[in-house]
Interface confidence: medium
């Protein structure tokens, strides 16, 4: 007992969907879990629309456990998941199915993460292995951003503006993060 367990750092970590038998006590009465935050931020309207509810970049709260190999965070973390469609969708006829289908008109707008926050988590490891500390990047807010035809999805612009505004006093964040850079994956806990 207490022997050093196999340390599986080199293996690829796959996020797993989990179902927890009972919610953690500290989050049991948290009414912000799994709900939209007032429909997100009301965006500026680059094209005319009568119904404001057509713009819906929603911030959904999800509680997750962080996992790394056989290890799992002692407590769940709560982060946002960006959901919804940005920009008014037009109902167009679908000749093949004789039904209706939604297609956004005009530029392509996406509801994507806007700001991130870093959180340090302690991972508990089974079999007598020492706990691990990990820093994870969690989504802090969502925003509608514009995707022009000249850019791929990593080159997103702010909703309603022609160019992305550089944030004052901040170093530019690298756009892409490799899987290895973020070793600790997030595991759904609902």
């Amino acid at each position: 007992q207490g022997w050093q367990a196999f340390k599986n750092d080199a293996t690829e970590i796959i996020p797993e969907l989990g179902e927890y038998p009972e919610p953690p006590p500290e989050l049991e009465n948290n009414k912000t879990m799994n709900r939209a935050e007032n429909g997100g931020r009301p965006p500026h309207h680059p094209f005319e629309t009568k119904d404001v509810s057509e713009y819906s970049c929603r911030e959904l709260h999800f509680t997750r456990y962080v996992t790394d190999g056989p290890c799992r965070s002692a407590k769940p973390v709560t982060e946002l998941v960006c959901s919804g469609q940005c920009g008014p969708a037009r109902l167009l006829p679908n000749a093949i199915g004789r039904g209706k289908w939604w297609r956004p008109s005009g530029p392509d707008f996406r509801c994507i993460p806007d700001r991130y926050r870093a959180q340090r988590v302690q991972l508990l490891c089974p079999g007598g292995e020492a706990p691990r500390a990990r820093k994870v990047r969690l989504v802090a807010s969502c925003k509608c951003k514009r995707l022009t035809r000249f850019h791929n999805q990593s080159e997103l612009k702010d909703f309603g503006t022609e160019a992305a505004r550089p944030q004052k006093g901040r170093k530019p964040r690298p756009r892409a993060r490799s899987a290895k850079a973020n070793q600790a994956e997030l595991e759904n806990a609902y």
Partner: nanobody, 120 residues
Framework: EVQLVESGGGLVQPGGSLRLSCAAS????????MGWYRQAPGKQRELVAT???????NYADSVKGRFTISRDNAKNTVYLQMNSLKPEDTAVYYC??????????????WGQGTQVTVSS
Amino acid sequence: EVQLVESGGGLVQPGGSLRLSCAASGSIFSDNVMGWYRQAPGKQRELVATIWSSGHTNYADSVKGRFTISRDNAKNTVYLQMNSLKPEDTAVYYCNLGTIVTGTWRSDYWGQGTQVTVSS
């Protein structure tokens, strides 16, 4: 007191299959991890596979694609389906149960072990 009882070990030919079971009895907290470890003669105990009460699984590289860990939360039982067995899988297989309460380890239990021998 928690007890872990393993079963299903035995002698099998290379390429064959075995299914190990580990039943936990006693007062067990719902937030837990169950796993299988093995120890070959003259070697250190090593992780084979683990599964959390959430269903999150992890496997040692040497058994990926051949072994499958599963559990029945209602019965507090964990299973290890071992396919395409190789002579190097020969070892004593131990069941482990760790439970978490308010963010810290509450307990760490081990079974007595079951012998798996892969030989022609």
